[in-house]
Interface confidence: low
């Protein structure tokens, strides 16, 4: 028998320094969480204490901090470089900045393999990425190979912006040659290593012939044997194992997200490739573990310029930004309008001739407004004034939701109106009108929203039955505020861009904005 | 106001266990965590470990793993701290202490003396 | 761990002298410093969180200071209820440590 660690992140989404538990801005060190110093002290413990070790990352590490916005993608590269790791899977957020944005900085600086066998240039792109990143790769590991095949949610199109020229094949359809491949070439054990969720991971363990273990991300799925160490609550046990089509019980393991945790999986094989054992379990990176002080001080030379960034000028406002709660939390606030106009403008991805675009609507709970801009500072907007409007360090997401779950997020925005609450909804592409004189529950007398298989974009009123697409901070997405229908009822849910990030890039792309308030929100003669 | 409540001292034999409360009163039980501390006679203070009443996930001194548990008891506002395997070395007054939002511990039990003797 | 050096172990003052307490940390704590005061059979008080920031109804003649490795604890002006052992303690990493104690005796 042979044994393997298989050690792996995902969805990292930028978190090079240490975070709080809840993956936001670390603000008491000794609470402090993850962080490439801290992960790579453990890898090297591991690396030190096990023979067979490989070093695994199931894509998005890109978005999520001011570290992608100012560095691009080169720190994604440097600290992996730094920390060694064997091999990577595109994720979706990886084309964030475009191909090019994903060649330049990552790429051609990266030591190890980047993989992805359902993504097939075309066109002028196919010589310029050839040999960038590879359908799989065989690694050696001791005395033996191990074979990493990749693969990257085939949603991509609609998540980010890998432009015309790349073609999103159905993971499993793609992947079946690539294996084939690899036993042709007498590697008989095989990690599927990709970025598409974790249901996609178990089908692919359970329909892809010679897939002996599932590396996963995109779904922040947590999985933990026994008495989990966090607040993270798990989605079964570590590894979660599926049989296959051909009867094979298949190890399939994802570790959460924002390198909380590192994900622990021993593998023991015979000698003919098969899984003999399996079992692990994510290994929570606290401060019970140091940070490594080399990384640490390469973090910290790379911080500086983050300092910097963080103060210059994104663009101006000739308008006051009313972030306030005496506005946000009771009626439309032109901060709301902004802030639901730049979650659009970024989720702007014309696929389809029918569709102007995928998605016109975004809901945005007052009370995750912070703060409001004076424009009587010469206007200037910085990072560090949007990170004040916008201080939780949370994702714009999307989400498909049916109309009725709508309109009950929408009973429950006013269902106490007048306290001051957070769950006040503030809107884009969706024109509502209360009246606050009915009962709880029945206040919304209108919903209107903004079509999208259009030419011409108009409000139509709102169908139950229907499915659509809405942006919304990961906050909603997850029931917060007491929106427990959206959480309850979603029937899709993709992670999107840092929020701060989302703003500012809107805000440096139209350069001067002046928000109105222009009657998204109304309430109906008589009780307002 | 806030205060920590722990119990009277004990007298316990080589080898046996013994589970020491401490009753919060006075705010949200939940929304600080609970740290517990060893004085030995004419020592200084010992960080045991650290306790967080929202999901009773724990952080113990690599010294006292194995030698202690720390639960609680959200339904009585009560940390525990059981001591197992007791010898002469255990003898001391342990202590426990809320921690505030910035993690530091601001309000302290009266200490519980724990004696071990046969 | 990380070791927090506190000097003097001992001293003796005079009511209405300044005194001052240090400890040292043996790396840099980032702040995250509380000072105690504990008397003969009681449990320690809490005076100072995060360097510097005074407890709710500690006397204003307790101040903290310091930052990085060195910090410092100063009563301004001694009074006699100030006698007792005083400790620090670094809570920017776990395990948590205390210094060894500093014992104010009255000259």
């Known amino acids: 028998a042979w044994e393997l660690t298989i050690l792996h992140t995902n969805d990292v989404h930028s978190r090079l320094e240490q975070t709080s538990e809840d993956s936001s801005k670390c603000v008491n060190a000794s609470r402090c969480m993850g962080g490439v110093a801290r992960l790579f002290t453990k890898v090297q413990q591991i690396r030190r204490a096990e023979p067979n070790v490989l070093l695994l990352d199931a894509g998005d590490q890109y978005q999520g901090t001011i570290w992608f916005t100012v560095y691009k993608g080169a720190e994604v590269a440097h600290f992996m470089n730094a920390l060694r790791y064997d091999a990577m899977a595109l994720g979706n957020h990886e084309f964030d900045n475009g191909v090019e944005g994903l060649i330049e900085p990552l790429l051609k600086e990266a030591k190890f393999p980047i993989l992805s066998a359902n993504i097939k240039a075309k066109g002028p792109l196919a010589s310029q990425i050839s040999g960038l990143y590879l359908p799989y790769k065989v690694l050696p590991v001791g005395d033996e190979v191990v074979g990493i095949v990749g693969y990257t949610s085939k949603e991509t199109p609609f998540l980010s912006n890998p432009g015309t020229n790349l073609v999103f094949e159905d993971e499993i359809t793609a992947l079946q040659p690539e294996v084939d491949k690899l036993k042709t070439l007498n590697v008989n054990k095989i990690i599927a290593l990709g970025h598409s969720g974790f249901e996609m991971d178990k089908l692919i363990a359970q329909k892809v012939r010679g897939v002996d273990v599932v590396v996963g991300g995109h779904s922040n799925t947590f999985l933990y044997t026994g008495n989990p160490p966090s607040k993270e609550v798990p989605a079964g046990k570590y590894p979660f194992i599926v049989t296959s089509d051909d009867g094979r019980k298949v190890p399939v393991v994802q570790a959460y997200a924002f390198g909380k945790y590192l994900g622990y999986l021993k593998i023991e094989f015979d000698e003919r490739g098969n899984v003999i054992s399996s079992h692990g379990n994510p290994i929570l990176l606290n401060s019970s573990i140091p940070e490594d002080p080399s990384i640490k001080a390469d973090i910290n030379k790379w911080r500086i310029k983050l300092d910097n960034y963080s103060t210059q000028e994104l663009g101006k406002t000739i308008v006051y930004l009313d972030g306030s709660s005496q506005s946000c939390r009771f009626r439309e606030c032109n901060m709301g309008n902004l802030i639901c106009d730049a979650m659009i403008n970024n989720n702007l991805r014309h696929t389809d001739e029918m569709f102007w675009n995928h998605v016109s609507m975004c809901i945005l709970n007052g009370g995750g407004i912070r703060s409001p801009i004076d424009e009587r500072n010469n206007g200037t907007i910085t990072w560090e004034n949007l990170a004040a409007v916008l201080p939780f360090g949370g994702t714009f997401d999307l989400v498909q939701l049916k109309g009725s779950t709508l309109k009950k997020a929408f009973e429950h925005s006013v269902h106490r109106y007048g306290q001051s609450t957070g769950e006040f909804l503030q809107v884009g592409g969706i024109h509502v009108v209360y009246d606050l004189s009915r009962k709880p529950g029945d206040r919304v007398v209108k919903l209107d929203v903004l079509c999208t298989k259009c030419r011409v974009p108009s409000y139509d009123p709102l169908k139950m039955d229907e499915v659509y697409k809405v942006i919304l901070p990961n906050f909603l997405a997850n029931g917060g505020d007491g929106f427990q229908m959206i959480k309850d009822e979603l029937l899709r849910h993709d992670s999107g861009d840092q929020d701060i990030n989302v703003v500012s890039t809107y805000i440096s792309k139209m350069k001067v904005i002046y928000p109105a308030v222009e009657g998204r929100i109304k309430f109906s003669t008589g009780s307002h | 106001q806030v205060q920590m409540k722990q119990s009277g001292p004990e007298l316990v034999k080589p080898g046996a266990s013994v589970k020491i409360p401490c009753k919060a009163s006075g705010y949200t039980f939940t929304d600080c965590n609970m740290d517990w501390v060893k004085q030995s006679h004419g020592e200084s203070l010992e960080w045991i470990g650290d306790i967080n009443p929202n999901n009773g996930g724990t952080i113990y001194n690599q010294k006292f793993k194995g030698k202690v548990t720390l639960t609680i008891d959200k339904s009585s506002s009560t940390a525990y701290m059981e001591l197992r395997s007791l010898t002469s070395e255990d003898t001391a007054v342990y202590y426990c202490?809320?921690?505030?939002?910035?993690?530091?511990?601001?309000?302290w039990g009266q200490g519980t003396s724990v004696t071990v003797s046969s | 761990d990380i070791q927090m050096t506190q000097s003097p172990s001992s001293m003796y003052a005079s009511l209405g002298e300044r005194v001052t307490i240090t400890c040292k940390a043996s790396q840099d704590i980032n702040s995250n410093l509380s000072w105690f005061q504990q008397k003969p059979g009681k449990s320690p008080k809490t005076l100072i969180y995060?360097?510097?920031r005074l407890i709710d109804g500690v006397p204003s003649r307790f101040s903290g200071s310091g930052s990085g490795q060195d910090y410092s604890l100063t009563i301004s002006s001694l009074e006699y209820e100030d006698m007792g052992i005083y400790y620090c303690l670094q809570y920017d990493v776990f395990p948590r440590t205390f210094g060894g104690g500093t014992k104010l005796e009255l000259k």
């Open positions: 995060r360097a510097n």
């Open positions: 202490a809320r921690t505030n939002w910035d993690y530091a511990m601001d309000y």
